[in-house]
Interface confidence: low
């Protein structure tokens, strides 16, 4: 903390301008009025202050606003935002999307810092849900943002926000996250026609149940292998050979390269070998011809 010292005669700052870069840290502390700084925060960004000088300016704002900065100041923090700790940010009440954008811009190009994560958390909690505009903004700055949320947090995403999600935003989502997002996407895109619907829903299919995959197989969608490999194993297992053939269309040939990997491996084990042979891909490991297949699922459900 900077020691309290009187401002030398003639050094009192009438405004925030470039002359302040020549002030020593103690002079900034003594000669810059905190209320003046708060009203002229937008000027700070244009002045090449050192990190040490920025520490002093932050200290002055902290003294002026011990309960947390007002949004009028927060919106103009600029590079001073990088000096804030998560503890500082937890005191803020950020409600304007413009404020959020301004601060995210400061951190642009860098990984999400603890400060940014806290800011986003405060903003989203303040809004009560991840609305479309917010999600649009966050994924623009951080494509992986959506997948950094827990399944519980994702449950607060309204289906309308799903329109803001791009395929790359889901790249790092795991199956449990897609389980939450898929039903929302299905709801969001339900009024689209077949081919358009598939384009939109494709990235979310890692959360799709068997009945939806069966329905898609009737729509001539030609799912690619990368998408198929991300499907839930338990959703793929009940599909018949004919359904998988229809689902993949010309991409069905790719099954051969994946025959030892889930979900293809487990699916093969559930198919009759003579059904697999109809694909002409040389897939091996199905149920030998002539074996009786008992469907125990009904018995298990009843016991």
């Amino acid at each position: 903390e900077v020691e309290k010292t009187a401002c030398p005669s003639g050094k009192k700052a009438p405004e925030i301008d470039e002359s302040l870069i020549f002030y020593k840290k103690w002079e900034l502390e003594a000669c810059v009025d905190a209320a003046l700084l708060a009203t002229q925060m937008d000027r700070v960004n244009a002045i090449p202050f050192t990190y040490e000088q920025l520490d002093v300016l932050k200290h002055k704002l902290d003294e002026l606003y011990p309960q947390g900065y007002p949004e009028s100041v927060i919106q103009h923090l600029g590079y001073l935002f990088l000096k804030m700790s998560p503890e500082d940010i937890r005191k803020w009440n950020v409600t304007s999307l413009e404020t959020l954008k301004a601060l995210l811009e400061v951190n642009k190009g860098h990984e999400m810092s603890p400060q940014v994560a806290t800011l986003i958390d405060r903003f989203v909690k303040g809004r009560g849900q991840l609305d479309k505009d917010t999600l649009d903004t966050l994924t623009a700055f951080y494509p992986g943002y959506l997948c950094s949320l827990s399944p519980e947090e994702l449950s607060s995403v309204p289906p309308s926000s799903i329109w803001a999600v791009r395929p790359q935003d889901l790249d790092t989502c795991d199956p449990r996250q897609l389980d939450v997002l898929y039903p929302k996407a299905r709801l969001a895109f339900q009024n689209m026609n077949g081919s358009e619907y598939f384009v939109k829903i494709q990235s979310f299919l890692g959360g799709a149940p068997t009945e939806d995959l069966k329905a898609l197989s009737q729509q001539n969608v030609s799912m690619d292998l990368a998408t198929f490999m991300k499907l839930r194993t338990d959703a793929v297992l009940p599909l018949t050979v004919a359904e998988v053939q229809k689902l993949l269309g010309p991409h069905v040939e790719g099954l051969k390269a994946e025959e030892r990997h889930r979900p293809v491996r487990d699916w093969i084990l559930r198919q009759r070998q003579d059904d697999l042979d109809t694909l002409g891909l040389g897939l091996q490991g199905g149920i030998p011809n002539g074996y009786l297949v008992l469907d125990l699922s009904m018995q298990e459900a009843l016991s």
Epitope: L149, S150, R176, Q177, A226, M229, A257, R260, H261
Partner: antibody, heavy 122, light 110 residues
């Protein structure tokens, strides 16, 4: 026989960088599974670092990694690399690579390499 | 975050006895939990996955149970070869995670 083997462990100066390589033999690298890195400081527990998908190239990593460690893959060489920067003494550990056995149904690591030792010291 | 807490940190067992190790998740992880055994100088060995499924080649003396946030590994008919450190590992999510492993439990057979 499917096997993983780590290499590249070494004595490195603080603030230095090092790249470890996980070589997968008997595994088809154009197929879908995760290769993960786990480390263990001397006398301590297991610490997950992150994973790279061999097919989609997706990467997941622990929240503490903070960009210091990067996981990359080479399909042609059948390797997954762990590039470590700004190393400190706290990064001294045996580094294991492991294969996630169940791509879709939770994470578990059935196949492990023997490990490679990284020592950070001046 | 999904934090895994293992208890106890160490335990002693007599040959032929039973050992119980507990693992608690800070949030529900369904049944996505694995158990590993590690001996000095060796990599970990998968014992159990999805909370209760025995990995191939693992003795049926090892039993996993639990779901949600509470899990247990039970070793019955303890043998000298069971002396090792045991780790639980959540397999539920990999996003926003500090460490997927629990802190470990050392088992001493005497």
């Amino acid at each position: 026989q499917e096997q993983l083997e780590e290499s590249g462990g070494d004595l490195v100066q603080p603030e230095g960088s090092l790249t470890l390589t996980c070589k997968a033999s008997g595994l088809d690298f154009s197929s879908s599974y995760w290769i993960c890195w786990v480390r263990q400081a001397p006398g301590k527990g297991l610490e997950w670092i992150g994973c790279r998908h061999t097919f989609t190239a997706n990467t997941w990593s622990a929240s503490w990694v903070n960009g210091r460690f990067t996981i990359s893959r080479s399909t042609s060489l059948g390797t997954v690399d762990l590039k470590m920067t700004s190393l400190t003494a706290a990064d001294t550990a045996t580094y294991f690579c492991a294969r996630d056995e169940s791509n879709n149904d939770g994470w578990d690591f059935k196949l492990w390499g023997p490990g490679t030792l990284v020592t950070v010291s001046s | 975050a999904y934090d895994m807490t293992q208890t106890p940190a160490s335990v002693s067992a007599a040959v032929g006895g039973t050992v119980t190790i507990k693992c608690q998740a800070s949030q529900s992880i369904s049944n996505y939990l694995a158990w590993y055994q590690q001996k000095p100088g060796q990599p970990p060995k998968l014992l159990i996955y999805q909370a209760s499924t025995l990995a191939p080649g693992v003795s049926s003396r090892f039993k996993g149970s639990g779901s949600g946030t509470e899990f247990t590994l039970t070793i019955s008919g303890v043998e000298c070869a069971d002396a090792a450190t045991y780790y639980c590992q959540q397999g539920y999510t990999s996003s926003n995670v500090e460490n997927v492993f629990g802190g470990g439990t050392g088992v001493v057979v005497g």
